[in-house]
Amino acid sequence: SHTLPVHFLQPSDIQKIVEELQSLSKMLLKDVKEDKGVLVSQNYTLPCLTPDAQPPNIIHSPAIRAYLKTIRQLDNKSVIDEIIEHLDKLIFQDAPETNISVPTDTHECKRFILTISQQFSECMDLALKSLTSGAQQATT
């Protein structure tokens, strides 16, 4: 019988989830960048890779989810719904909530959205690189 502990998501699934997130992050960034004249800010930092970066906890999924949920509330980007669904595949059901302080100024909101979207896209590139290099090491 196949009753393995499903804590162990198959590596192929983790890879596919991260690939999907990478693709969706590019779509989000492209969408956000259509708002011209907005610059990235140094005031916001999206947590990215976990210290040990071990699958499935390769990225800070709960924190990333909270940031993206905040963007969804500030700006109705429907691609975020799909991003959240994929992040939920990597989030343990008892993971603590992350509180995000939201900027109130309209222009600052736009900077927040651009900055986090850009960092998210870069984070997914890093995560995929980390996964593929880890997979190569495992086969050598």
Epitope: H2, V6, D88, K89, F92, D94, A95
Partner: antibody
């Protein structure tokens, strides 16, 4: 053991609305997606939508968009599915379902409500 | 939306026969697939989740497998109590669509 108890059978007139409830007990998880599914007489299972009760986040089937509203009351651990502008084709058994497993996202629905029969007839 | 094509829509087999039901996803959904059994007038019951993990209390004659975007539910030795309709459902991204169902009868 998770238990889902749904509200009783309803008979409704075409054009009206119905609100079905689903009370969950016996679980501790906070991050989960609960789904609503319906089954017309002699037909297959049809996905209607889902809710993430911790945030009230919802997803709907394109077929029901604009007619269905899924909500949740965290204080009573109860989810609701409201379907408006009812027509005879909406006569069906409506189910809520709840997942088990370590992740927020489901990969199967382990627990199902007993079903609520909704009959739409003039 | 991801389509789930289930086949056959119905089958008739003898007690003790090996029965296979297939669901094909319209795109790669990884292992995010579940199988349910629904007996007439009853609530659906989860048999298999994450493509090949047996749900608690499910008899060992039921198993799930995957090859690419094709998913198979196998009943290794059909029993009279297995008369039911079987459904697959994917959980890759919403809408979490179901296959059309397979009605299993005893010859």
């Amino acid at each position: 053991q998770v238990q889902l108890v749904q509200s009783g059978a309803e008979v409704k007139k075409p054009g009206s609305s119905v609100k079905v409830s689903c009370k969950a007990s016996g679980y501790t998880r906070t991050r989960y997606w609960m789904q609503w599914v319906r089954q017309a007489p002699g037909q297959g299972l049809e996905w209607m939508g889902a809710i993430y009760p911790a945030e009230g986040d919802t997803r709907y089937s394109q077929k029901f968009k604009g007619r269905v509203t899924i909500t949740a009351d965290k204080s009573t651990s109860t989810a609701y599915m409201e379907l408006s502008s009812l027509r005879s084709e909406d006569t069906a058994v409506y189910y809520c379902a709840f997942p088990e497993g370590p992740y927020a996202a489901p990969y199967g629905m382990h627990y199902w409500g007993q079903g609520t029969t909704v009959t739409v007839s003039s | 939306a991801i389509q789930m094509t289930q086949s056959p829509s119905s089958l008739s087999a003898s007690v003790g026969d090996r029965v296979t039901i297939t669901c094909r996803a319209s795109r790669n959904i990884g292992n995010y697939l579940a199988w349910y059994q629904q007996k007439p007038g009853k609530v659906p019951k989860l048999l298999i989740y994450y493509a090949k993990t047996s749900a608690s209390g499910v008899p060992s004659r039921f198993s799930g497998s995957r090859s690419g975007t094709d998913y198979t539910l196998t009943i290794s030795s059909l029993q009279p109590e297995d008369v039911a309709t079987y459904y697959c459902q994917h959980f890759w991204s919403t809408p979490w669509t179901f296959g059309g169902g397979t009605k299993v009868e005893i010859k």
